[in-house]
Interface confidence: low
């Protein structure tokens, strides 16, 4: 399977909400022993490998923001921890999964990574990630609503065992 990032850049005004999205593509094993661990984190550009560094999103780590379920099942973070920080990650039946960030501030600007790990029995992992940029703007030049820019290539780099 692969991860697609429909949009590579999100430009939003301060105070707005934004939903960053990734999509799981390709054949997904629906075996009873297969589960998918999906999560989000911040990273930085200029690394040898994009998304290799895992930084918290609003002080929440990738462990805090995880979704954990079978293939194309729906799920969302219901725990108060994320919602208290104005965050919610969600996944639908079609392989889309997202993180919603409420009341954006300039500090939210940066590179965001989605991660999908396929877990079989023990830890024979197959993992892929996608990256996207969020720019939060303020002042007279800021857009009134979020503007999204499609990825030049819909598929992000397919990385196994990142």
């Amino acid at each position: 399977f692969k991860v697609a990032t429909p949009y590579s850049l999100y430009v939003c005004p301060e105070g707005q909400n934004v939903t960053l999205t990734c999509r799981l593509l390709g054949p997904v094993d629906k075996g009873h022993d297969v589960t998918f661990y999906k999560t989000w984190y911040r990273s930085s550009r200029g690394e040898v490998q994009t998304c290799s560094e895992r930084r918290p999103i609003r002080n929440l780590t990738f462990q805090d923001l995880h979704l954990h379920h079978g293939g194309h099942q729906a799920a969302n973070t219901s725990h108060d921890l994320a919602q208290r920080h104005g965050l919610e990650s969600a996944s639908d039946h079609h392989g889309n999964f997202s993180i919603t960030m409420r009341n954006l501030t300039l500090l939210d600007s940066g590179l965001y990574c989605c991660l999908v790990v396929e877990i079989r029995h023990h830890h024979s992992e197959h993992r892929v990630h996608g990256a996207m940029e969020l720019q939060v703007q303020t002042g007279k030049d800021a857009p009134s609503n979020c503007v999204v820019y499609p990825s030049s290539s819909q598929d992000s780099e397919n990385i196994t065992a990142a």
Epitope: Y37, F62, Q63, D64, H66, I119, S124, E125, H126, T160
Partner: antibody, heavy 120, light 112 residues
């Protein structure tokens, strides 16, 4: 701050059972496997097994099957390990430890350890 | 079970010296997915173990760059380029490629 708070020391008689606890705080409890590790005489470490707090799935070291039982209570973010039919061989420090990357077997946060002493 | 053999058992060093600890596994630690799950921990007296290096050579967050890990297959090494007082304790290697996970017997780093 991510923490694993373990229950206090236990003194048990041979043949008895003991249940020790490990309360997680500062992170989403269901996001990573919880592992249990035995340490004898402050030296060797032995992996007992782990539990996926989300599903309750367990994986045991064959050596500890029948000796240790791992459970979780998601509502209180607490992992438990019960040891039964205790003998002097079970006297040790027992640690709970969080798997850093969900289920890959390297542990970034450890409890302070619970000392179990088995003596008549 | 995979047996992890560490050498030396004890390593007396002077502060500022380089230290090297070897860990050998009884079978290859290369997983079928291509990763090698070999890790290093430091346990200071009276404390819990702390993760230093994971998957052979990745330094864990906050670990100083004087620590480095290397190796492949069955032979692995932890190097400390300039030993400091806070580095003293028992070092354990560990593998999680095969169940059960297993640990080495430990190497005690002490002042010469």
């Amino acid at each position: 701050e991510v923490q694993l708070q373990q229950s206090g020391p236990e003194l048990e008689k041979p043949g008895a059972s003991v249940k020790i606890s490990c309360k997680a705080s500062g992170y989403s409890f269901t996001g990573s496997n919880m592992n249990w590790v035995k340490q004898n005489n402050g030296k060797s470490l032995e992996w007992i097994g782990n539990i996926d707090p989300y599903y309750g799935y367990t994986t045991y070291n064959q050596k500890f099957k029948g000796k240790a039982t791992l459970t979780v209570d998601k509502s209180s973010s607490t992992a438990y390990m019960q040891l039964k039919s205790l003998t002097s061989e079970d006297s040790a420090v027992y640690y709970c430890a969080r798997d850093y990357d969900y289920a890959l077997g390297y542990f970034d946060v450890w409890g302070a350890g619970t000392t179990v002493t088995v003596s008549s | 079970d995979v047996v992890m053999t560490q050498t030396p058992l004890s390593l007396p060093v002077s502060l500022g010296d380089q230290a090297s600890i070897s860990c050998r596994s009884s079978q290859s630690l290369v997983h079928s997915n291509g990763n090698t799950y070999l890790h290093w921990y430091l346990q200071k007296p009276g404390q819990s173990p702390k993760l230093l290096i994971y998957k052979v050579s990745n330094r864990f967050s906050g670990v100083p760059d004087r620590f480095s890990g290397s190796g492949s297959g069955t032979d692995f090494t932890l190097k400390i380029s300039r030993v400091e007082a806070e580095d003293l304790g028992v070092y354990f290697c560990s593998q999680s490629t095969h169940v059960p996970y297993t640990f080495g017997g430990g190497t005690k780093l002490e002042i010469k």
